[in-house]
Interface confidence: medium
């Protein structure tokens, strides 16, 4: 009986849970695109339950298909500032190991200061999720503006 | 057996399954920028499963991480509308109880009519989701157009 | 014992993992308005696992509530292009049976070149859904730009 | 037409806890869609948020005073309190209460009481 | 915390003069900003909110503008009773916080 019972909790181990949501940290040096994340619950309401963060560039733990979000907000912007600085675009993608390099979303703010987006992708343990943001407006730190996470779906 | 065969049901009811999906019933009286909610299957594709509305705002009832998000389109609107009634700005966070008030998600329109986002974050039964939109222009109430919802994610 | 065992697989079979993520294959002939999608792992990160492919457009396999999220992206586009060629608007909907047609998510393009959005939807098996983009624009095939998913999230 | 009057000894010695009362007519502390706030401001300085609370006794604090500072409610007799423990000269300032109209993102202020001065001085 | 900064820290003006206040936030606050004016020895009075809604009682004279981290208070024609402090304050992110103050004085 105690063995049906220990069994039959497997399903919910093997459904993974793997979460994770960052808020932006920082922006890097001249010369890398990248944005910088961080997450905790000393922080806010960012997390991670399985996922990793190397570098402020988020490592996923688990094999599986995940739904990957991010919203990010220029900081100093109206819609003429958006337009006058175009192309401002971001793209997240698996930036390591090298081998499976990809864009996997990208959008451009043409005249809008804020794009949000999801997408369900296959993920493997290791891969390095980075995101780029391209053009010379800075992004917003507010925790309601700028996100990004993932979130394990199926095997 | 039948002590296993109830037992291995836990997993299922531990997932928690809570998950709404709103449409639009009406805005606020002057000076209340809330969007005020419905759900149901009898007003078309909106449901409740687990979340209860409160005076057209959605409480939560099970702890956890969730998945909200939101699409608003503005009523008659324009690029040009929406650029001369700037600022019109959504925003989505916990409204009740008071100590747990936080802003989760928040969005301008700026030259567009149509907002759309998501993201995860740890809600507590109990928590009320208000979603306020300032400004003067008013929210289509077009079931495909302007919807709200959340998704229980994990424990 | 090992009907316990066996028994206590069913929550995780019940879940349905029922998912599926799409690339464009390409735009209708005219007065066809629909986009035709295709998937699967010989052409990168697109899958279909549940789902079926029915001429370019998705058909659901289980009942369910599910997860629909679209990103658009216009081919050749500048916030100038997008409002000369307003209105430019994206309609996912099930298009079959008839008995079912209905219209789940609507967005214009207005100034910008990429729509996003998602919602939750109660979904019956043989469902179709269609995509249709309305305009003279067309859309990017860029599998970073252009997607289309459904993921199952409750019974 | 809301009014709100402050309450309370005008002077307090270092160390001690500042008490004050702020007595709302022609409204109702009870109100769905009000935050009640307590604001300072030092002689000839600028304004300081302290926190506010909600008629179901949910508060929310400045986190640079939280550790000294409680906000209460009294829907019966429609009065809201501050307390601000271990007073420092620094603490001197007018203490004003007043009504906070927004939501979860924060709120401004619509109504005001005339403002207290209560100094710190042993 | 957001830090507003405001400028210039006195304007001397004369009545019948057009007046314009700036406010700074060290980072987006949307349009959750709010004005309020006071005058010696009286609390402060809410003039405007969500940068460019006038509260009830305001007179059109005076009017926001602005949104992100810039905005602006205008007040069209100045009247001898507009002489007084001007604060601007936002509700973006806790805690709220008030700028430091932009005197308008009789020149």
């Known amino acids: 009986q105690r063995f049906a019972q220990a069994q039959q909790q497997l399903p919910l181990e093997s459904l993974g849970w793997d979460v994770a949501e960052l808020q932006l940290n920082h922006t890097g040096p001249q010369q890398d695109p990248r944005l910088y994340w961080q997450g905790g619950p000393a922080l806010g309401r960012s997390f991670l339950h399985g996922p990793e963060l190397d570098k402020g560039q988020l490592r996923i733990h688990r094999d599986g298909i995940y739904m990957v979000h991010i919203q990010v907000t220029l900081a100093i912007c109206s819609s003429t500032t958006a337009s006058r600085h175009h192309p401002t675009t971001l793209a997240v993608g698996i930036c390591s190991p090298a081998s499976r390099s990809i864009s996997l979303l990208r959008l451009s703010f043409h005249q809008g200061c804020t794009i949000a987006s999801q997408r369900l992708t296959p993920l493997a343990r290791g891969d390095t999720l980075c995101t780029n943001l391209t053009g010379t407006l800075l992004p917003s730190r507010n925790t309601d503006e700028t996100f990004f996470g993932v979130q394990w779906v199926r095997p | 057996q039948r002590f296993a065969q109830a037992q291995q049901q836990l997993p299922l009811e531990s997932l928690g399954w809570d998950v709404a999906e709103l449409q639009l019933n009406h805005t606020g009286p002057q000076q209340d920028p809330r969007l005020y909610w419905q759900g149901g299957p009898a007003l078309g594709r909106s449901f409740l499963h687990g979340p209860e509305l409160d005076k057209g705002q959605l409480r939560i009832h099970r702890d956890g991480i969730y998945m909200v998000h939101i699409q608003v389109t503005l009523a008659i609107c324009s690029s040009t509308t929406a650029s001369r009634h700037h600022p019109t700005t959504l925003a989505v966070g916990i409204c009740s109880p008071a100590s747990r008030s936080i802003s989760l998600l928040r969005l301008s329109f700026h030259q567009g009519c149509t907002i759309a986002s998501q993201r995860l974050t740890p809600l507590a039964r109990g928590d009320t989701l208000c979603t306020n939109l300032t400004g003067t222009l008013l929210p289509s109430r077009n079931t495909d157009e302007t919807f709200f919802g959340v998704q229980w994610v994990r424990p | 014992q090992r009907f316990a065992q066996a028994q206590q697989q069913l929550p995780l079979e019940s879940l349905g993992w029922d998912v599926a993520e799409l690339q464009l294959n390409h735009t209708g002939p005219q007065q066809d308005p629909r986009l035709y999608w295709q998937g699967g792992p010989a052409l990168g990160r697109s899958f279909l696992h549940g789902p079926e492919l029915d001429k370019g457009q998705l058909r659901i396999h289980r009942d369910g509530i599910y997860m629909v999220h679209i990103q658009v992206t216009l081919a050749i586009c500048s916030s100038t292009t997008a409002s000369r060629h307003h209105p430019t608007t994206l309609a996912v909907g099930i298009c079959s049976p008839a008995s079912r047609s209905i219209s789940l998510l609507r967005l214009s393009f207005h100034q910008g070149c990429t729509i996003a959005s998602q919602r939750l939807t109660p979904l019956a098996r043989g469902d179709t859904l269609c995509t249709n983009l309305t305009g003279t624009l067309l859309p990017s095939r860029n599998t970073d730009e252009t997607f289309f998913g459904v993921q199952w999230v409750r019974p | 037409q809301v009014q709100l009057q402050e309450s309370g000894p005008g002077l307090v010695k270092p160390s001690e806890t500042l008490s004050l009362t702020c007595t709302v007519s022609?409204?109702?502390?009870?109100?769905?869609?009000?935050?009640w706030s307590w604001i300072r401001q030092p002689p000839g300085k600028g304004l300081e948020w302290l926190g506010y609370i909600y008629y179901s006794g949910s508060t929310n604090y400045n986190p640079s005073l939280k550790s000294r500072v409680t906000i209460s409610v009294d829907t019966s007799k429609n009065q809201f309190s501050l307390k601000l423990r271990s007073v420092t000269t620094a603490d001197t300032a007018v203490y004003y209460c007043a009504r906070g109209d927004g939501d979860f993102l924060g709120v401004c202020f619509d109504y005001w009481g005339q403002g207290t001065l209560v100094t710190v001085s042993s | 915390e957001i830090v507003l900064t405001q400028s210039p820290a006195t304007l001397s003006l004369s009545p019948g003069e057009r007046a314009t206040l700036s406010c700074r936030a060290s980072q987006s606050v949307s349009s959750y900003l709010a004005w309020y004016q006071q005058k010696p020895g009286q609390a402060p009075r809410l003039l405007i909110f969500?940068?460019?809604n006038r509260a009830t009682g305001i007179p059109a004279r005076f009017s926001g503008s602005g949104s992100g981290t810039d905005f602006t208070l205008t007040i069209s024609s100045l009247e001898p009773e507009d002489f007084a402090v001007y604060y601007c304050q936002q509700r973006s992110n806790w805690p709220l916080t008030f700028g430091g103050g932009t005197k308008v004085e009789i020149k």
């Open positions: 022609g409204g109702s502390v009870s109100s769905d869609y009000y935050y």
């Open positions: 969500d940068a460019s």
